[in-house]
Interface confidence: medium
C-alpha cells in the first residue's frame, strides 16, 4: 500500500528538494540499485531540510519625467547609488526554476515559476506566476517579461513531466529478510511518452542519499522504524515526492537458556529453561533417540516440560528453540542438552529351548531380550527339582550345558536376563531326564 505521492489539485506548498547529487557527494552507481549497510545508529531517519529557492536582488533606479519650457519632455534619470541599466528579461530570468504541481482530477500540471515578482507570460496566461493546464510529456513555451527588465523576453520551454499517478513507491523488501533489510523501489505502473532518460530518482534515509530508482538498506535492527523520503525529478525539476516509514520485522528470537535436563525415571525426563529475551510466540522442543526424532509445540509461557513414555536406559538429545510468526516464521537458535534415562527391568528372553544331550545332561539356549533397558548383559539359569534349587548359573551368553542331573527326574528351567540393575522376567520350561539307557 503505497502513499499517494503527490498533492491533490493545484498547490503552492513547496516541499524542499533533497540535496543535489553534487551536494550529497555520493558517487552514482553503475546499476540502478544502491545498497546501504547500516545499523541501529541509522534508526532515527529525519529528512534533511534544504531549499533551492533562488532570489535575485536588483537595485531599482527611480525615473523622473520633467516637462521643459518648450513643451518637449526631457527625461532625466536620477540614479540612486550606482544603479546598473535594466537587465534584459532573458538575462534576469536565465536561471529560473520551475516546480510542477499535479491535479489528480484533471490529470494536468501547473508549472510554478520560482520568481520573486509577478511576471507576465506572453501568449500563455499565467496567474500568480503559475502556468496552468499543462499536459504531461508535452513541451510548452512561455515568454516571460516584467517591467524590471527589458526585451528580449525570457523564452522558457516547459518540459512537462509524466503524470504523477504513473509512479508508485513500492516496498520491495523480501519477507525472509524483512527483519534486517529494507528495499524501496519506484515502479512505473502506466506507460507515458516522456523520455525516461530525463527522469532521475532520489532517496534520503537518515543521512544517506541515493540517486537510484531502487534502494536496499541492509544490516538494520529488527523492530525499528526507519524513515525514507524520496522524490522524482524530470529534467532536474521535482514533480513528485513520497515518504515511507517502514518498521523492520520481528527478528529471530534468541536462544533459550536450558537450566537442566535429566531423567526422572526409566520412562520419564524433565527439561527446564529460561526464555530468550527477544519477542517470540512459542517453543519447539525436539527429542532425538538414535535416529528417531519427535517434536512438540510448547506454549510460550512454559519454562519446564515433563517428557513421558521414554525408553529406559536410552540417550536422548533434546533441542529447544523459540520461534516467532512474523512476515515469515523465524526460528531462534536451538539450545541443546542430553541425558540417559534410568534403567528398568529388561524384557523376557525368548525362543528358549531345552534339549537333552545325554541321559543326564541338558543344553539350554535362548535369544536375548528385545529390550535390555540397562548397562550390562548377563544371562542367568536356575534349575529346580520340585521346589529345590539345584543349579544357578550365570553366563555372558544364553548358552548353558547342564550336566550330572538325576535320571528320570522332572526339572524346571528358568532363564532370565540381568542388565546390571534389574533382572528380567524368567522364561520357564519343564523337562525331564530319562531312565539311563545303560
Amino acid at each position: 500500500q503505497s502513499p499517494t505521492p503527490s498533492p491533490t489539485g493545484v498547490s503552492s506548498v513547496q516541499t524542499p528538494h533533497l540535496p543535489t547529487h553534487a551536494d550529497s557527494q555520493t558517487p552514482s552507481a553503475g546499476t540502478d540499485t544502491q545498497t546501504f549497510s547500516g545499523s541501529a545508529a541509522n534508526a532515527k531517519l529525519n529528512p534533511t531540510p534544504g531549499s533551492n529557492a533562488i532570489s535575485d536582488a536588483y537595485l531599482n533606479a527611480s525615473e523622473t519625467t520633467t516637462l521643459s519650457p518648450s513643451g518637449s519632455a526631457v527625461i532625466s534619470t536620477t540614479t540612486i547609488a550606482t544603479t546598473p541599466s535594466k537587465p534584459t528579461c532573458d538575462e534576469k530570468y536565465a536561471n529560473i526554476t520551475v516546480d510542477y504541481l499535479y491535479n489528480k482530477e484533471t490529470k494536468l500540471f501547473t508549472a510554478k515559476l520560482n520568481v520573486n515578482e509577478n511576471v507576465e507570460c506572453g501568449n500563455n496566461t499565467c496567474t500568480n506566476n503559475e502556468v496552468h493546464n499543462l499536459t504531461e510529456c508535452k513541451n510548452a513555451s512561455v515568454s516571460i517579461s516584467h517591467n524590471s527588465c527589458t526585451a528580449p523576453d525570457k523564452t522558457l520551454i516547459l518540459d512537462v513531466p509524466p503524470g504523477v499517478e504513473k509512479f508508485q513507491l513500492h516496498d520491495c523488501t523480501q519477507v525472509e529478510k524483512a527483519d534486517t533489510t529494507i528495499c524501496l523501489k519506484w515502479k512505473n505502473i502506466e506507460t507515458f511518452t516522456c523520455d525516461t532518460q530525463n527522469i532521475t530518482y532520489r532517496f534520503q534515509c537518515g543521512n544517506m542519499i541515493f540517486d537510484n530508482k531502487e534502494i536496499k538498506l541492509e544490516n538494520l535492527e529488527p523492530e525499528h522504524e526507519y524513515k525514507c523520503d524520496s522524490e522524482i525529478l524530470y529534467n532536474n525539476h521535482k514533480f513528485t515526492n513520497a515518504s515511507k516509514i517502514i518498521k523492520t520485522d520481528f527478528g529471530s528470537p534468541g536462544e533459550p537458556q536450558i537450566i537442566f535436563c535429566r531423567s526422572e525415571a526409566a520412562h520419564q525426563g524433565v527439561i527446564t529453561w529460561n526464555p530468550p529475551q527477544r519477542s517470540f510466540h512459542n517453543f519447539t522442543l525436539c527429542y532425538i533417540k538414535e535416529t528417531e526424532k519427535d517434536c512438540l509445540n510448547l506454549d510460550k509461557n512454559l519454562i519446564k516440560y515433563d517428557l513421558q513414555n521414554l525408553k529406559p536406559y536410552t540417550k536422548y538429545v533434546l533441542s529447544l528453540h523459540a520461534y516467532i510468526i512474523a512476515k515469515v516464521q523465524r526460528n531462534g537458535s536451538a539450545a541443546m542438552c542430553h541425558f540417559t534415562t534410568k534403567s528398568a527391568p529388561p524384557s523376557q528372553v525368548w525362543n528358549m529351548t531345552v534339549s537333552m544331550t545325554s541321559d543326564n545332561s541338558m543344553h539350554v539356549k535362548c535369544r536375548p531380550p528385545r529390550d535390555r533397558n540397562g548397562p550390562h548383559e548377563r544371562y542367568h539359569l536356575e534349575v529346580e527339582a520340585g521346589n529345590t534349587l539345584v543349579r544357578n548359573e550365570s553366563h555372558k551368553n544364553c548358552d548353558f550345558r547342564v550336566k550330572d542331573l538325576q535320571y528320570s527326574t522332572d526339572y524346571t528351567f528358568k532363564a532370565y536376563f540381568h542388565n546390571g540393575d534389574y533382572p528380567g522376567e524368567p522364561f520357564i520350561l519343564h523337562h525331564s531326564t530319562s531312565y539311563n539307557s545303560k
Partner: antibody, heavy 119, light 107 residues
Framework: QVQLVESGGGLVKPGGSLRLSCAAS????????MNWIRQAPGKGLEWVSY????????YYADSVKGRFTISRDNAKNSLYLQMNSLRAEDTAVYYC????????????WGQGTLVTVSS | EIVLTQSPATLSVSPGERATLSCRAS??????LAWYQQKPGQAPRLLIY???TRATGIPAKFSGSGSGTEFTLTISSLQSENFAVYYC?????????FGGGTKVEIK
C-alpha cells in the same frame, strides 16, 4: 579421557590484548557448551563467558562485556577468548570448562593459564 | 545478579568429624545449585549438582540438600584429602555466579 588444555596467558600492559586458547580432546567437542571461568590470585571463582555448540548463544559477565570475545572452532576442537582493553583487575588464572550435557554446571576443567595485567 | 553467600568463610574440623557448609542465595534459585571442591594449585572439581545429586565418581560421604535460598553441603568423616576450599554455584539465571568459598582446614 577428557582433557582441556589452556594456553596463551602471560604478562600484558593495561590496555593491551591477549588471546587465550583451549584445546579439547577425549570427547565430542561439538556437542558441548563451553565456558571461561577465572580466579584472581587468592580469590574466588568468577564465571566469564559461555558459548553454545553452534556459537549461536553467547553470554558474558558484565565485567568483561564489550572487551572480551568468546569463540570456538569445532573442526579444531578449540575454544578461544580474545581479551582486549585489559585492566589490572583482569589479572587471574583463566580456566576453560565444559558444561555437562544436561545442566549448566562444569564437569571438566583445564589446569588454567595465568594472565597478568601490569605496567 | 544472584548473590551467593557462603558461611563460614573458614571451617576448622578434626579428621573423622563431620563438616557442614552453608550457601545462601539472594533470591530463590529452586534447586539449581552446584558444589565444587578446589585444592591448592588445582582446578575445581564438580561434587554436587541439582542441590543434591552427586556427580559421577563422587563418594557418598558428600551430600547436598536444600532448595530455594538455603543450601547445605555435608562432608561426613573428613579425611586429609577432603581439606580444601568449597564453592557453591547457581545456574538458575544469567549471569552464572559463585559463592565466595568456604575453606575447610584441619583443626
Amino acid at each position: 579421557q577428557v582433557q582441556l588444555v589452556e594456553s596463551g596467558g602471560g604478562l600484558v600492559k593495561p590496555g593491551g590484548s591477549l588471546r587465550l586458547s583451549c584445546a579439547a580432546s577425549g570427547f565430542t567437542f561439538n556437542v558441548y557448551y563451553m565456558n571461561w571461568i577465572r580466579q584472581a590470585p587468592g580469590k574466588g571463582l568468577e564465571w566469564v563467558s559461555y558459548i553454545s555448540t553452534s556459537s549461536s548463544a553467547i553470554y558474558y559477565a558484565d565485567s568483561v562485556k564489550g572487551r572480551f570475545t568468546i569463540s570456538r572452532d569445532n573442526a579444531k576442537n578449540s575454544l578461544y577468548l580474545q581479551m582486549n582493553s585489559l585492566r589490572a583487575e583482569d589479572t587471574a588464572v583463566y580456566y576453560c570448562a565444559r558444561r555437562t550435557g544436561s545442566t549448566t554446571v562444569f564437569d571438566y576443567w583445564g589446569q588454567g593459564t595465568l594472565v597478568t595485567v601490569s605496567s | 545478579e544472584i548473590v551467593l553467600t557462603q558461611s563460614p568463610a573458614t571451617l576448622s574440623v578434626s579428621p573423622g568429624e563431620r563438616a557442614t557448609l552453608s550457601c545462601r542465595a539472594s533470591q530463590s534459585i529452586n534447586n539449581n545449585l552446584a558444589w565444587y571442591q578446589q585444592k591448592p594449585g588445582q582446578a575445581p572439581r564438580l561434587l554436587i549438582y541439582g542441590a543434591s545429586t552427586r556427580a559421577t565418581g563422587i563418594p557418598a560421604k558428600f551430600s547436598g540438600s536444600g532448595s530455594g535460598t538455603e543450601f547445605t553441603l555435608t562432608i561426613s568423616s573428613l579425611q586429609s584429602e577432603n581439606f580444601a576450599v568449597y564453592y557453591c554455584q547457581q545456574y538458575n539465571k544469567w549471569p552464572l555466579t559463585f559463592g565466595g568459598g568456604t575453606k575447610v582446614e584441619i583443626k
